[in-house]
Interface confidence: low
């Protein structure tokens, strides 16, 4: 194995419109040009890239659905973070929709956890 076969750690370039790829890759927040000679900045609020890449296009920012609120807006290096509206939650096994939280517990049970954007209310038997 030659000296060149090991990979020097890539340092993130400061944010700028255009820069040169390092070993054929562009830093987060950029994509590569068609001729692979330039790194082009993603458009803030429109698209993004999260890691070193040779994408010809940045990834499109997610738009929050109705029933969701935007917790973090899309930057050039991070996708939008959407969260279910108050009173609704997202189940792990069906993450595509926000479900309504239950309003109360069945008879004989007490609420031990409130509704959050990630989980329904939690009920336990009174005696437990």
């Amino acid at each position: 194995i030659t000296r060149q076969s090991l990979d020097p750690q890539r340092r993130a370039a400061p944010q700028q419109k255009r820069s040169s790829p390092i070993e054929g890759l562009c830093p987060p927040g950029h994509h590569i040009s068609e001729d692979s000679r330039e790194c082009i900045s993603c458009k803030y609020g429109q698209d993004y890239s999260t890691h070193w890449n040779d994408f010809l296009f940045c990834l499109r920012c997610t738009k929050c659905d109705s029933g969701e609120v935007e917790v973090n807006s899309c930057t050039t290096t991070r996708n939008t973070v959407c969260q279910c509206e108050e009173g609704t939650f997202r189940e792990e096994d069906s993450p595509e929709i926000c479900r309504k939280c239950r309003t109360g517990c069945p008879r004989g049970m007490v609420k031990v956890k409130d509704c959050t954007p990630w989980s329904d209310i939690e009920c336990v038997h009174k005696e437990s």
Partner: antibody, heavy 121, light 118 residues
């Protein structure tokens, strides 16, 4: 949950061929580089081949160059390793591993359980 | 001589701290490389533990507790994996690795078998 499941291993005669598959789920397969790493019985890890997120760039260890071909089908969330002209020294457990970068080897952050390839007459 | 050298075996008592070593051959400079560490328990696939370049540039693997930490000694051309509060489940083979240019390869060390003494 990220899952990588290898299949296609088995017993093959020297000079024979085998095609390994790796089914990926739980992440956006088309934006990650992928690799095959093998481990001979009782031995250490040996990187075999790597492919970038789009399948445009493929890389091989000298020991398999010209005999093995790595490929991917992003529509099927699948990674493949076509192994030809197999030798006894190719006997190993073959692991499919995800790269934490799109193209460059950064860290092999998730691994499958592996599939055993035995080359013997 | 391999590019990455690891002692074949090390042992330490339950609850203690141990430091595993990965020495880069001296025709390479560890100062410009990240060091990766993987754990492999018997009968299991490898698991990514961490990547270490510097104190300000490092990353922990998925669900890897902070008991596992990385460091480097540039003068000695070595990478280290420290494991504190050793537990029985830490008994495993530990491989260091270094990434290669443009995704070309991952160079693995030969591995260190860690034994946890009760």
């Amino acid at each position: 949950e990220v899952q990588l499941v290898e299949s296609g291993g088995g017993l093959v005669k020297p000079g024979g061929s085998l095609r390994l598959s790796c089914a990926a789920s739980g992440f956006t397969f088309s934006t990650y580089g992928m690799h095959w790493v093998r481990q001979a019985p009782g031995k250490g890890l040996e990187w075999v081949a790597g492919i970038n997120y789009s399948g445009n760039n493929k890389y091989y260890a000298d020991s398999v160059k010209g005999r093995f071909t790595i490929s991917r089908d992003n529509a099927k969330n699948s990674l493949y390793l076509q192994m030809n002209s197999l030798r006894a020294e190719d006997t190993a457990v073959y692991y499919c591993a995800r790269d934490s970068s799109t193209t460059r080897t950064r860290a092999l952050d998730y691994w499958g359980q592996g599939t055993l390839v035995t080359v013997s007459s | 001589q391999p590019v990455l050298h690891q002692p074949p075996a090390m042992s330490s008592a339950l609850g203690t701290t141990i430091r595993l070593t990965c020495t880069l051959r001296n025709d390479h400079d560890i100062g410009v490389y990240s060091v990766y560490w993987y754990q492999q328990r018997p009968g299991h696939p490898p698991r990514f533990l961490l990547r270490y370049f510097s104190q300000s540039d490092k990353s922990q693997g998925p669900q890897v507790p902070p008991r596992f930490s990385g460091s480097k000694d540039v003068a000695r051309n070595r990478g280290y994996l420290s494991i504190s509060e050793l537990q029985p489940e830490d008994e495993a083979m530990y491989y260091c690795a270094m990434g290669a240019r443009s995704s070309v390869t991952h160079v693995f060390g030969s591995g260190t078998q860690l034994t946890v003494l009760s």
